[in-house]
C-alpha cells in the first residue's frame, strides 16, 4: 500500500506525445505502475510504464501515433491514470481529466545553425519540431546567450513575441567563443509551459581587424 | 496573401438543401483548418464547425450537427459547407475562415442565403 | 454552452476619446477569449487573441484585459474607421460561442 501525498503532471507536445511525471511522497516497493491514457472520443487507448528519475518520481511517455501526427484536438479530454500492480490486481493510484490543448509543452526547437557571423553580431536560425499545425504563428520564443565566465542562469532572457525562427545577436565581443539556447511556447493553453531548452549552439565571433577600430 | 473567396447568393425553398464554396489561396490548405459561421440578419455570430485538413476530421456545434455537411477537395484548395432541410430561420449570411482551432484569423466576404417559400 | 454576454449594447463616444466595451462569460474560460471588428457589409476581423494579445497589423490603441470570467476591450482614442460592432468569443468549452456585440457608434 501506499500513502504520503502524490502529484500527477502531463504535458501534450502537440502532435503525438503526452509526457508525465508522478511524484509519490510515500515509500513504494519494487512495484510496477504504468499510465495508462483513455480518450473521450477515439477508439484508440495507450499505455507507457513509469520508470523512476529520481527517489520519488516516476516519468514516462505517451507515445499516440507517427511523430508529426495530430493525434487529439482541442475538443479531445483524455482521462489519464496511474496504475500500479498490487498482486494480481492493478491499483488507481491517481487520475486526471486531461484537456490536452490547455496543458502543452512542445519539443525543443532544432536544427539550431549560424547564419552568418561578425565581429560584434551572429545570425542564428532553428526550427520547431512536431509543432501542430493549429497554432499557425501564434508562438513565442525565450532565447539565452552563454557568454565567458557566466553561467547558464545568468544569462539575460530575450523574448521573441512572435513566430520568429531566428535572431540577431548583437553587442557582442570579438573573438569570443558563445553558446546559445532558444526554447518554445504557444499562445494556447492555460496550464501551457515552455519547451526544454535546445541543444546549445556553440559559435565564435570573427577576430577584429588589425589596426581598425571596430 | 490570404484569401478565401465565397460563392454567391443563394435562394433556396424551405427543406431544400445549399451547398457554399470557400476557394482559398495564399496558404497551404491542405495543413489548414477551415471554419464557419452563421450571422443571420440583424443577429450575432453563430459558429456552426470546422474541417481539419490535416487531421481529415470534421467538428460541427450541436445546434448544426444534424443538418450541417462540411467537406474538402485539397486538389482545388476549395472548402465546402452544405446545409440541408432549410427552414426561414436559416436566411443568414454565411462565412468560412481559416484559423487555428480556438480563433478565426482570416474570413471569407460571405455568402447570403435566402430561405423563402 | 458557455454564454458570453456583452455590454452596453450600443456605446456612443466621441472621435478622439477612449472606448471601454465589456464581455462576460457565464463560467470561468481562463483567458481563452478573442475579439473581432465587424463593419457594415464586411467580414468580421480578429482583433486581439487570448484576452490581451494583438494581431499583427492592428493598431496600438486596441487593447485587452481579463478581471476573472469579465474581459475588456479599450480603443485608447478612437478613430472614425473604429466605429463598427464588436463582437467576443469563447474557446474554453466546445462548442465556441460569441457574445451578441456592442455597437460602437459616433457621439
Known amino acids: 500500500a501506499v500513502n504520503g501525498t502524490s502529484q500527477f503532471t502531463c504535458f501534450y507536445n502537440s502532435r503525438a506525445n503526452i509526457s508525465c511525471v508522478w511524484s509519490q511522497d510515500g515509500a513504494l516497493q519494487d512495484t510496477s505502475c504504468q499510465v495508462h491514457a483513455w480518450p473521450d472520443r477515439r477508439r484508440w487507448n495507450q499505455t507507457c510504464e513509469l520508470l523512476p528519475v529520481s527517489q520519488a518520481s516516476w516519468a514516462c511517455n505517451l507515445i499516440l501515433g507517427a511523430p508529426d501526427s495530430q493525434k487529439l484536438t482541442t475538443v479531445d479530454i483524455v482521462t489519464l491514470r496511474v496504475l500500479c500492480r498490487e498482486g494480481v490486481r492493478w491499483r488507481v493510484m491517481a487520475i486526471q481529466d486531461f484537456k490536452p490543448f490547455e496543458n502543452l509543452r512542445l519539443m525543443a526547437p532544432i536544427s539550431l545553425q549560424v547564419v552568418h557571423v561578425e565581429t560584434h553580431r551572429c545570425n542564428i536560425s532553428w526550427e520547431i519540431s512536431q509543432a501542430s499545425h493549429y497554432f499557425e504563428r501564434h508562438l513565442e520564443f525565450e532565447a539565452r546567450t552563454l557568454s565567458p565566465g557566466h553561467t547558464w542562469e545568468e544569462a539575460p532572457l530575450l523574448t521573441l513575441k512572435q513566430k520568429q525562427e531566428w535572431i540577431c545577436l548583437e553587442t557582442l565581443t570579438p573573438d569570443t567563443q558563445y553558446e546559445f539556447q532558444v526554447r518554445v511556447k504557444p499562445l494556447q493553453g492555460e496550464f501551457t509551459t515552455w519547451s526544454p531548452w535546445s541543444q546549445p549552439l556553440a559559435f565564435r565571433t570573427k577576430p577584429a581587424a588589425l589596426g581598425k577600430d571596430t | 496573401e490570404v484569401q478565401l473567396v465565397q460563392s454567391g447568393a443563394e435562394v433556396k425553398k424551405p427543406g431544400a438543401t445549399v451547398k457554399i464554396s470557400c476557394k482559398v489561396s495564399g496558404f497551404n490548405f491542405k495543413y489548414s483548418l477551415i471554419h464557419w459561421v452563421q450571422q443571420a440578419p440583424g443577429k450575432g455570430l453563430e459558429w456552426m464547425g470546422w474541417?481539419?485538413?490535416?487531421?481529415?476530421?470534421?467538428e460541427y456545434a450541436p445546434g448544426f450537427q444534424d443538418r450541417v455537411t462540411i467537406t474538402a477537395d485539397t486538389s482545388t484548395d476549395t472548402a465546402y459547407m452544405e446545409l440541408s432541410s432549410l427552414r426561414s430561420e436559416d436566411t443568414a449570411v454565411y462565412y468560412c475562415a481559416r484559423g487555428g482551432p480556438w480563433f478565426l484569423s482570416y474570413w471569407g466576404q460571405g455568402t447570403t442565403v435566402t430561405v423563402s417559400s | 454552452e458557455i454564454v458570453m454576454t456583452q455590454s452596453p449594447a450600443t456605446l456612443s463616444v466621441s472621435p478622439g476619446e477612449r472606448a471601454t466595451l465589456s464581455c462576460r462569460a457565464s463560467q470561468i474560460i481562463s483567458n481563452n477569449l478573442h475579439w473581432y471588428q465587424q463593419k457594415p457589409g464586411q467580414a468580421p476581423r480578429l482583433l486581439i487573441i487570448y484576452g490581451l494579445q494583438s494581431i499583427s497589423g492592428i493598431p496600438a490603441r486596441f487593447s485587452g484585459s481579463r478581471s476573472g470570467t469579465e474581459f475588456t476591450l479599450t480603443i485608447s482614442s478612437l478613430q472614425s474607421e473604429d466605429f463598427a460592432v464588436y463582437f467576443c468569443?469563447?474557446?474554453?468549452?466546445?462548442?465556441?460561442?460569441f457574445g451578441q456585440g456592442t455597437k460602437l457608434e459616433i457621439k
Open positions: 474541417i481539419d485538413n490535416e487531421a481529415g476530421e470534421t
Open positions: 468569443q469563447q474557446s474554453n468549452n466546445f462548442p465556441w460561442t
